[in-house]
């Protein structure tokens, strides 16, 4: 019987010879559980596992803790891959995180973190980041040191308010912090003075809601 090949991430898919962008089935580390992810096989050498994408407002990102844990949306469009998979994956080996952003004026920027991982669910999927480079701000728009993940039904932020309920979306809120890529999607000409929009403070400031975002990860030794 032919042994089925399984892939942990899009870097493994790429190295196996599949170099076309698209949706691939990945397997949880040390498990047979599977998950579908979009693989970017072209940007910056390819092998990128897309863990988040916003582009048109077609998917509601004001979701529960469980939904952010397991993932939601459509890998070919707007989606969240899932905190549990990303946590397990990024604790197996060292990963880099690239965040690609687009504004409504045709500009693009990115932030690249040379080391990224999420803690386990017991530690509220706290984000850990090191080594920022890129064009989307010299200071990290994800607060350092990293914060716990919060959702509308899981308030782990440092604000007297409830950031996820107020600003919408699950995110690593501080009080409430310089970013929220899972906020409300606002169309062009309605995207300024939006305090609950898609925010990356150190690129566009506090009230500007972005047009598109992609979060992608790849092994550091790719």
């Amino acid at each position: 019987k032919e042994e089925q090949i399984s892939f942990r991430d899009c870097a493994e898919v790429f190295k196996s010879g599949h170099t076309t962008n698209g949706i691939y089935t990945l397997t949880f580390p040390n498990s047979t559980e599977e998950i579908k992810a979009y693989c970017d096989m072209e940007a910056g050498g390819g092998g990128w596992t897309i863990i988040q994408r916003r582009e048109d407002g077609s998917v509601d990102f004001q979701r529960t803790w469980k939904e952010y844990k397991v993932g939601f949306g459509n890998p070919s469009g707007e989606y969240w891959l899932g905190n549990e998979f990303v946590s397990q994956l990024t604790n197996q080996q060292r990963y880099v995180l690239k965040i690609h952003l687009k504004d409504w004026e045709g500009n693009e920027a990115y932030s690249l973190y040379e080391h990224f991982y999420l803690s386990s669910e017991e530690l509220n999927y706290r984000i850990h980041l090191k080594g920022l480079t890129g064009t989307a701000g010299k200071i990290s728009s994800i607060s350092q040191p990293g914060n716990d993940f919060s959702t509308k039904d899981g308030d782990n932020d440092k604000c007297i308010c409830k950031c996820s309920q107020m600003l919408t979306g699950g995110w690593w809120f501080d009080a409430c912090g310089p970013s929220n890529l899972n906020g409300m999607y606002y169309p062009q000409r309605q995207n300024t003075n939006k305090f609950n929009g898609i925010k990356w403070y150190y690129w566009k400031g506090s009230g500007y809601s972005l047009k598109a975002t992609t979060m992608m990860i790849r092994p550091a030794d790719f």
Epitope: I139, S141, S143, C159, D174, A175, C176, G177, P178, F195, K199, Y201, Y202, G205, S206, G207
Partner: nanobody
Framework: DVQLQESGGGLVQPGGSLRLSCAAS????????MSWVRQAPGKGLEWVST????????GYADSVKGRFTISRDNAKNTLYLQMNSLKPEDTAIYYC????????WGQGTQVTVSS
């Protein structure tokens, strides 16, 4: 610790007035623009007004222009919102917000306009 404490909300009849205050502490208040933002029942956040750090420039949402006035007293680390000619559609929780990287928020103050 950073704190923003809104006060001055309450129940008022249509056409009435209220003055909201926001007391700030724990950060350099006079270095940041400040805003008032509101959230009506079952709705998302709506920008109301912004004032620059020195107090010389202001902006207002069309829905409140001519009725609301934002001001600040940097010596007292306090932001204000004078609300006149109140309408039922002004009913909301009102938050002050600092244009700081953290985007600090308070708990809000409830304004209810009803006869």
């Amino acid at each position: 610790d950073v704190q923003l404490q809104e006060s001055g909300g309450g129940l008022v009849q249509p056409g009435g007035s209220l003055r909201l205050s926001c007391a700030a502490s724990g950060f350099t208040f006079n270095s940041y623009a400040m805003s008032w933002v509101r959230q009506a029942p079952g709705k998302g956040l709506e920008w109301v007004s912004t004032i620059n750090s020195g107090g010389g420039r202001t902006g207002y949402a069309d829905s409140v222009k001519g009725r609301f006035t934002i001001s600040r007293d940097n010596a007292k680390n306090t932001l204000y919102l004078q609300m006149n000619s109140l309408k039922p559609e002004d009913t909301a929780i009102y938050y002050c917000n600092a244009d700081h990287p953290q985007g600090y928020w308070g708990q809000g103050t409830q304004v209810t306009v009803s006869s």
